[in-house]
Amino acid sequence: FERTRSLQDPCSNCPAGTFCDNNRNQICSPCPPNSFSSAGGQRTCDICRQCKGVFRTRKECSSTSNAECDCTPGFHCLGAGCSMCEQDCKQGQELTKKGCKDCCFGTFNDQKRGICRPWTNCSLDGKSVLVNGTKERDVVCGPSPADLSPGASSVTPPAPAREPGHSPQ
């Protein structure tokens, strides 16, 4: 016959938010302050993450879930669970070891994070450039030149760059 897990292990009855206290005859004890257990049957509670310095608290720790951090204004999250905060740059720039640098000609960054990327090569798809690229914006591709009506201008000047543009995610 098949024994249930609870008969084999009294700790399996301890719900999330508690731990199986070996010092108290395997009684389910609540997690102490600043600790949590997100699953049942745990023998210890985990210490809550603390959001300090450039990190700020996005979600408070509870007895059943860890705290979640994000970054203070001017910084954005990197890594799983926002393990690091990286400085924002302006649109049209990228972060280098020497700080924020403008995108080189032919590249753009429409966000406050990430790298400068080459303008899209519209001809890859048999299209033409409809709107020129800038440091802050990619080109906009349009129909191939053959699709344009005679006399129609194929390239529009870029739209003026504006903040905030693409918000940091």
Partner: antibody, heavy 119, light 107 residues
Framework: QVQLVQSGAEVKKPGASVKVSCKAS????????INWVRQAPGQGLEWIGN????????NYNQKFKDKATITADKSTSTAYMELSSLRSEDTAVYYC????????????WGQGTTVTVSS | DIQMTQSPSSLSASVGDRVTITCQAS??????LNWYQQKPDKTVKLLIY???RARSGVPSRFSGSGSGTDFTFTISSLQPEDIATYFC?????????FGQGTKLEIK
């Protein structure tokens, strides 16, 4: 021609996860953004996030940051979206889309994948 | 996030009618405004991008206009195959956002 073919409908229990795939063909997969968009029953369209397959750079709508994980496999020209901790509110049609030749519009749409969350 | 307010939410028109749908952005989005058609079978198609540009193969009866915050989508002469829901979408700022849609029916 450019095509995005999505995986089939899924029925999941609350709390489970689901991974939806989007197989691209007819173009250079690494050169275009892939977006994911959802449509709940009787509702409008919501942008979840996107990925640039060349370097797997992602953007997420803050609303879906803890719900969706977007990845891409260059070797198979396939993008994926995994949805975790499913709830009944996640019941929707999920679309993958490709940009038109810069990220600002979505020219090609997959056929949609229906994800139903029900106990 | 940029809010996109689309109106009307539904409309009924006759074949041959001129149909106009409007979309208003909560902040300036320059010309980064697109229009999509979703057929009853749920397939979605880009019709107009960058406010005024029709995708190749899109019938000339579909057009778009506007700039900044106010945009208009027009079907100059409604055809039976135009039965669909139409959505506007801003591509200016992440997260990209859509209007709530306009369901178009034939009288």
């Amino acid at each position: 021609q450019v095509q995005l073919v999505q995986s089939g409908a899924e029925v999941k229990k609350p709390g489970a996860s689901v991974k939806v795939s989007c197989k691209a063909s007819g173009y250079t997969f690494t050169s275009y953004w892939i977006n994911w968009v959802r449509q709940a029953p009787g509702q409008g369209l919501e942008w979840i996030g996107n990925i640039y397959p060349s370097d797997s750079y992602t953007n997420y709508n803050q609303k879906f940051k803890d719900k969706a994980t977007i990845t891409a496999d260059k070797s198979t020209s396939t993008a994926y979206m995994e949805l975790s901790s499913l709830r009944s509110e996640d019941t929707a049609v999920y679309y993958c889309t490709r940009d038109y030749g810069s990220a600002y519009s979505m020219s090609t749409w997959g056929q949609g994948t229906t994800v139903t969350v029900s106990s | 996030d940029i809010q996109m307010t689309q109106s009307p939410s539904s409309l009924s028109a006759s074949v041959g009618d001129r149909v106009t749908i409007t979309c208003q952005a909560s902040q300036d989005i320059s010309n980064y405004l697109n229009w999509y058609q979703q057929k009853p079978d749920k397939t979605v198609k880009l019709l107009i991008y960058y406010t005024t540009r029709a995708r190749s193969g899109v019938p000339s009866r579909f057009s778009g206009s506007g700039s900044g915050t106010d945009f208009t989508f027009t079907i100059s002469s409604l055809q039976p195959e135009d039965i669909a829901t139409y959505f506007c979408q801003q591509g200016d700022t992440l997260p990209y956002t859509f209007g709530q849609g306009t369901k178009l029916e034939i009288k």
